[in-house]
């Protein structure tokens, strides 16, 4: 059985302040069953950036239609980027459980923020 892969194709993305940033992530399989979540940073202090089930993330939207069947694209778009958004973003697959268990993380995409052109 092939092992699930979480693919973040870009190592880094540079965006001008005020613009939107697209962070790409795809998975190689629909199973194991369980959600995808996005975080900024790694380790216990990481910040949850997007999880469809819980929380309110007004600046974050999925790139693909959330109602699309059997879709393996979990890319997100973050609007109105500010310098405070800089950091490394990880797309993380969880195995469903009580609680869900982290299964595999993408390699991360570093977001850098350029000054807004005057």
């Amino acid at each position: 059985e092939e092992e699930l892969q979480v693919i973040q194709p870009e190592k880094s993305v540079s965006v001008a302040a005020g613009d939107s940033a697209t962070l790409n992530c795809t998975v190689s399989s629909l199973i194991p069953v369980g959600p995808i979540q996005w975080f900024r940073g790694a380790g216990p202090g990481r910040e949850l950036i997007y999880n469809l089930k819980e929380g309110h993330f007004p600046r974050v939207t999925p790139v693909s239609d959330p109602t699309k069947r059997n879709n393996m694209d979990f890319s997100i778009r973050i609007s109105n980027i500010t310098p405070a958004d800089a950091g490394t973003y990880y797309c993380v697959k969880f195995r469903k459980g009580s609680p869900d268990v982290e299964l595999k993380s993408g390699a991360g995409t570093e977001l850098s923020v350029r000054a807004k052109p005057s």
Epitope: E1, L30, I31, V33, R69
Partner: antibody
Framework: EVQLLESGGGVVQPGGSLRLSCAAS????????VTWVRQAPGKGLEWVST??????YYADSVKGRFTISRDNSKNTLYLQMNSLRAEDTAVYYC???????????????WGQGTLVTVSS | EIVLTQSPATLSVSPGERATFSCRAS??????LAWYQQRPGQAPRLLIY???IRETGIPERFSGSGSGTEFTLTITSLQSEDFAVYYC??????????FGGGTKVEIK
């Protein structure tokens, strides 16, 4: 065309065992979670168990008695049922899971079911 | 466990008429709700998922609506093949997946 064909049902005494099979065709079986749902005579639908790859999930009513498994090389889903009770009497359906990307699973194809009767 | 309550349990409708029935969830399930049709002696068939999206091949007379805790399935102009039992299912929070108790649509 997606097809799911259950087999292995029958009459068994309380405390007995039975193994159900579900032969799948028409889709990439190994790429999808698959599920057993049952329906007692004249009653509604009750989820029994789901398997992904190595991950398995059970209803409380069958936990510890039933075991779900799959053989991707044979495109077949199984349900091993032990310590059967009268209340396990039902038509057992296998179903293919379909996933809405950011969300959960529902069941887009169903077999015709196999009847399990637990009676002395 | 999320409990789904369907009402009415039985609906008597004349062919050609409109049928509307509901599914209420005991807690918010957002749009993670599916509807199935089960004709006598047959397996269930997926009609609607994500509360409102018709499965491929399902006639336009079937429509789903609602979100959160209140959902509705509407069948406009009932055909003879639509007389069946209809079940809702939530997939927001599982295990367990849960189904409603069903609504039987019978000929008036």
């Amino acid at each position: 065309e997606v097809q799911l064909l259950e087999s292995g049902g029958g009459v068994v005494q309380p405390g007995g065992s039975l193994r159900l099979s579900c032969a799948a065709s028409g889709f990439s079986f190994s790429n999808f979670a698959v599920t057993w749902v049952r329906q007692a005579p004249g009653k509604g639908l009750e989820w029994v168990s789901t398997i992904g790859s190595g991950d398995t999930y059970y209803a409380d009513s069958v936990k510890g008695r039933f075991t779900i498994s799959r053989d991707n090389s044979k495109n077949t889903l199984y349900l091993q049922m032990n310590s059967l009770r009268a209340e396990d009497t039902a038509v057992y359906y296998c179903a293919k899971d379909s996933t809405v990307s950011w969300s959960g699973d529902f069941f887009d194809y169903w077999g015709q079911g196999t009847l399990v009767t637990v009676s002395s | 466990e999320i409990v789904l309550t369907q009402s009415p349990a039985t609906l008597s409708v004349s062919p050609g008429e409109r049928a509307t029935f509901s599914c209420r969830a005991s807690q918010n399930v957002k749009n993670d709700l599916a509807w199935y049709q089960q004709r006598p002696g047959q397996a269930p068939r997926l009609l609607i998922y994500a509360a409102r999206i018709r499965e491929t091949g399902i006639p336009e007379r079937f429509s789903g609506s609602g979100s959160g805790t209140e959902f509705t399935l509407t069948i406009t102009s009932l055909q003879s093949e639509d007389f069946a039992v209809y079940y809702c299912q939530q997939y927001y929070d599982w295990p367990p997946f849960t189904f409603g108790g069903g609504t039987k649509v019978e000929i008036k």
